[in-house]
């Protein structure tokens, strides 16, 4: 077959494709054609790239010429430079390769010139009139990753037909760029269509794993089915799943609908969506979203406690007034000294099996007559009455419940978050809080969450800062920055929230949720270190508003200072030529030194190798900051809303009456 047939063709590697379009076009038309497909005219800057171009072009006729991405304006001759004054269409003159047909001649360069590549022989570079419609053009497409060509299977009717994002259709690919589609026809009649997609674990891969063409019947490899294989009358096989599972999109594997279901608490297979959500006792489905569960306020139920009731998330507590004791049923109250008191104390002992000094706990419990409240995130709240101890937690919260803690003293360093404690205990109730003072720290037991003392020991994974999602208007959701590290001073002033600032982040990889895998502690400063983000997403420097209104402690409003930090990407070896000029990284804007906060650049670790000749090298060797239209406007406000604590029935009576006896009830007792 004539390689110069009318059909375009391409050669792809793991990170870029070259495509040959045998269409007669002027330079400008060719440039536009490449841009419309999401690429650029080819810029073969290295011998390796030139080799790929050579293999794509092949041994064409000498009469054929192909545009590449080099042009020179009139009177811009620089004959001593490798590119002779020509500039790549990406805007720079960096190259480690040239292939000029003739040595430079000392002409005056009176007119604009563009470069075409000879289709024959050594594919030499020729300069000529940009308005000449040559025989074709070479485009180049860069991408984040590629999928390897599919292996042929026994049951295939022919080779896979690939369609690239730049609309090339061929069976002759070694690599397929992200976004390509593979169509496989099977001998059995049915076909499969696969997409080269981003994988959850990173990288790219085909949307389906092989085998794509099932054998005849169920006998070989269960027909490719994960669960049950059924042989149809026409000889085809179909797959079925056992109860509680549903057939996945690939038609062969089975998936648990609850594995992906967004149920907050409990999930059961079945129903119109393939699953249905349920709430545990003490909770009910939220009216606006049946996937979520909200606390049931049992204290609103008449007669739930004989005397006083305090609701908390997932349960409630009954209390008795001074001179009364809670009976064994946890509801009734009897005058002090009556028979029920011992039973109640026994129950407390049984539930509190943790080796702590119970007298101390009782004393601390009684001493505290401030209110309980939920602490949903990194917040300071003004205490109604400061306790005489540092932090107190209720032990053994089931994992989906937010613990409630007494208001901490404002002079204490704040906890990073109210930790989510894994649910270890088989005991159904929630017992009295373990109170730990700063002078006498107590080791947590299996039923108690760890207490964060003043020296901030490193948090375990279960207790790390929850990710705070932020809507950043200029970025797609996959690229929204999270709050990347939090630092606070050891002693924030009383009644003032600490500053929360994001240090310079190593930005998240696209399409990956930000996680907090590595929290390190130095003194009283805690910094959470995060995995890296590609350098085409500038970080936000955020500062917390100076004062949070006491009446709205659940709202964190972050202002973005819109300070774009210069990014030094993970360096690639620079191309060493005499024609070097600094190139900005793709899609990045460096901030002039004058506008940068003085302290910020010191946070940037230098990642450049010692042999780097340019201060900033491009992320992709062919990239230059394009002139992207900018919509100027005010700096975007970034509001982070933390979930409000569920309204609790405030124990107003507790202020006047001491808590002589109390009980904590889990609604599963009801």
């Amino acid at each position: 077959q004539d390689p110069w047939a009318a059909e375009p063709r391409a050669a792809c590697g793991p990170s870029s494709c070259y495509a040959l379009f045998p269409r007669r076009r002027t330079f400008l038309e060719a440039w536009r054609a490449c841009r419309e497909l999401g690429g650029d005219l080819a810029t073969p800057r290295t011998p390796e790239e030139a080799q790929r171009v050579d293999s794509l072009v092949g041994a064409g006729p000498a009469s054929r010429l192909l545009w590449i991405g080099l042009q020179r304006q009139a009177r811009q001759c620089q004959l001593q430079r490798p590119l002779r004054g020509f500039t790549w269409t990406t805007g720079d003159q960096d190259t480690a390769f040239t292939n000029w047909a003739q040595p430079a001649s000392g002409g005056p360069c009176p007119a604009q010139r563009c470069v075409a590549l000879e289709a024959s022989g050594e594919h030499r570079w020729l300069e000529g009139s940009c308005t000449l419609a040559v025989d074709g053009y070479l485009c180049q497409f860069g991408f984040e990753g590629a999928c390897p060509a599919l292996q042929d299977e026994a049951g295939q009717a022919g080779p896979a037909v690939y369609t690239t994002p730049f609309h090339l259709v061929s069976t002759e690919f070694e690599w397929l760029p992200f976004g390509s589609v593979a169509a496989v026809q099977c001998q059995a009649g049915r076909g499969a269509s696969l997409l080269c997609v981003k994988q959850p674990e990173g990288g790219v891969g085909w949307s389906r794993a092989g085998p794509l063409c099932l054998g005849t019947g169920c006998s070989p490899d269960n027909g490719g089915c994960e669960h049950e294989c059924v042989e149809e009358v026409d000889g085809h096989v179909s797959c079925r799943c056992t109860e509680g599972f549903r057939l996945a999109a690939d038609g062969r594997s089975c998936e648990d609908p609850c594995a992906q279901a967004p149920c907050e608490q409990q999930c059961e297979p079945g129903g119109p969506q393939g699953y249905s959500c349920h709430c545990r006792l003490g909770f009910r489905p939220a009216e606006d979203d049946p996937h979520r569960c909200v606390d049931t306020d049992e204290c609103q139920i008449a007669g739930v406690c004989q005397q006083m009731c305090v609701n908390y998330v997932g349960g409630f507590e009954c209390y008795c007034s001074e001179g009364h004791e809670l009976e064994a049923d946890g509801i009734s109250c009897s005058p002090a000294g009556a028979m029920g008191a011992q039973a109640s104390q026994d129950l407390g002992d049984e539930l509190l099996d943790d080796g702590e000094d119970e007298e101390d706990e009782d004393e601390a419990w009684k001493a505290f007559n401030g209110g309980w409240t939920e602490m949903p995130g990194i917040l300071w709240m003004e205490p109604t009455q400061p306790p005489d101890f540092a932090l107190a937690y209720r032990p053994s919260f089931p994992e989906d419940r937010e613990p409630q803690i007494p208001y901490p003293e404002p002079t204490w360093p704040p906890p990073l978050s109210a930790p989510r404690v894994p649910y270890h205990s088989s005991v159904l109730s929630v017992t009295r809080p373990v109170v730990v003072s700063a002078t006498h720290p107590t080791l947590p037991s299996a039923h108690q969450p760890p207490v964060i003392p003043a020296t901030h020991p490193a948090l375990s994974r279960d207790h790390q800062i929850p990710v705070i999602a932020a809507n950043y208007p200029d970025l797609p959701s996959a690229y929204q920055p999270g709050i990347l590290s939090v630092s606070h001073s050891a002693q924030p002033p009383a009644h003032q929230p600490p500053m929360i600032s994001t240090k310079y982040p190593e930005l998240f990889p696209a399409h990956q949720s930000p996680m907090f895998p590595d929290t390190r502690v130095a003194g009283t400063q805690t910094t959470t270190h995060l995995p890296g983000i590609p350098p085409n997403h500038a970080p936000l420097v955020t500062t917390l508003g100076a004062q949070l209104p006491p009446q709205a402690p659940d709202a964190l409003v972050l202002r973005t200072q819109a300070t774009q930090l210069p990014i030094i990407p993970t360096a690639q070896p620079s191309l060493t030529t005499t024609s070097r000029s600094p190139v900005s990284p793709a899609h990045q804007i460096s901030v002039p030194a004058a506008t940068q906060p003085a302290a910020l650049p010191t946070l940037l670790p230098s990642q450049s190798p010692t042999n780097q000749t340019s201060p900033i090298s491009p992320t992709h060797p062919h990239s230059k900051a394009p002139q992207i239209p900018r919509e100027d406007g005010p700096s975007p406000k970034l509001a982070l809303w933390l979930p409000s604590p569920a309204p609790t029935a405030a124990p107003t009576a507790l202020g006047e009456a001491g808590l002589a006896e109390h009980s904590q009830r889990d609604d599963r007792w009801l």
Partner: antibody, heavy 124, light 108 residues
Framework: QVQLVQSGPEVMKPGASVKMSCKAS????????IHWVRQAPGKRLEWMGY????????TYNQKFKGRVTITVDKSASTAYMELNSLTSEDTAVYYC?????????????????WGQGTLVTVSS | DIQLTQSPSFMSASVGDRVTITCRAS??????VAWYQQKPGQAPKLLIY???NRYTGVPSRFSGSGSGTEFTLTISSLQSEDFATYYC??????????FGQGTKLEIK
Amino acid sequence: QVQLVQSGPEVMKPGASVKMSCKASGYTFTDYVIHWVRQAPGKRLEWMGYINPYDDDTTYNQKFKGRVTITVDKSASTAYMELNSLTSEDTAVYYCARRGNSYDGYFDYSMDYWGQGTLVTVSS
Amino acid sequence: DIQLTQSPSFMSASVGDRVTITCRASQNVGTAVAWYQQKPGQAPKLLIYSASNRYTGVPSRFSGSGSGTEFTLTISSLQSEDFATYYCQQYTNYPMYTFGQGTKLEIK
């Protein structure tokens, strides 16, 4: 040296067809496009069409409305041009010309070598 | 179609004279312009390609300039063998070549 040698003069009747030849030598025939250009007495040069001997790719001037056909015989390194439905307006000298590919590091589509021309006279 | 207009159509000059012939294009053709010399009974010969590049073997007294729509052929010192007809040609909308009507240069 490069040479394009054309066939001899033709006298044709109106309505007839004429086919002339252009034999190339001194270069690789399939590496260069061949154009046909005519020049009527006292008129400017007029491009008629071309053929790429490498793949027989052809393009014609719309003015000739399908009356012209250009072919090649690669084995003989010869290009042919046939013009049908002749009228007196077609009386002219017909040239074959080779399109240059590059000169001294420049690509260019000017015509660097020409045949001596074939005079076609259309007369009743 | 792109039209090429040469001026003058006829001109007389003497040996040693400096001669300039102009070619105007009806639209921008960049530098895709060539100049040919044709003597009676002969085929055209290429003098200048890409508006300003002298073809191999062409004497240095011939030069070309211009880009866009205006082009000139200059003979710096006319020789007796230079009396001929000169044609400009554009090939920017290749393969639709068009030629100017020609400038006949005669001995004064």
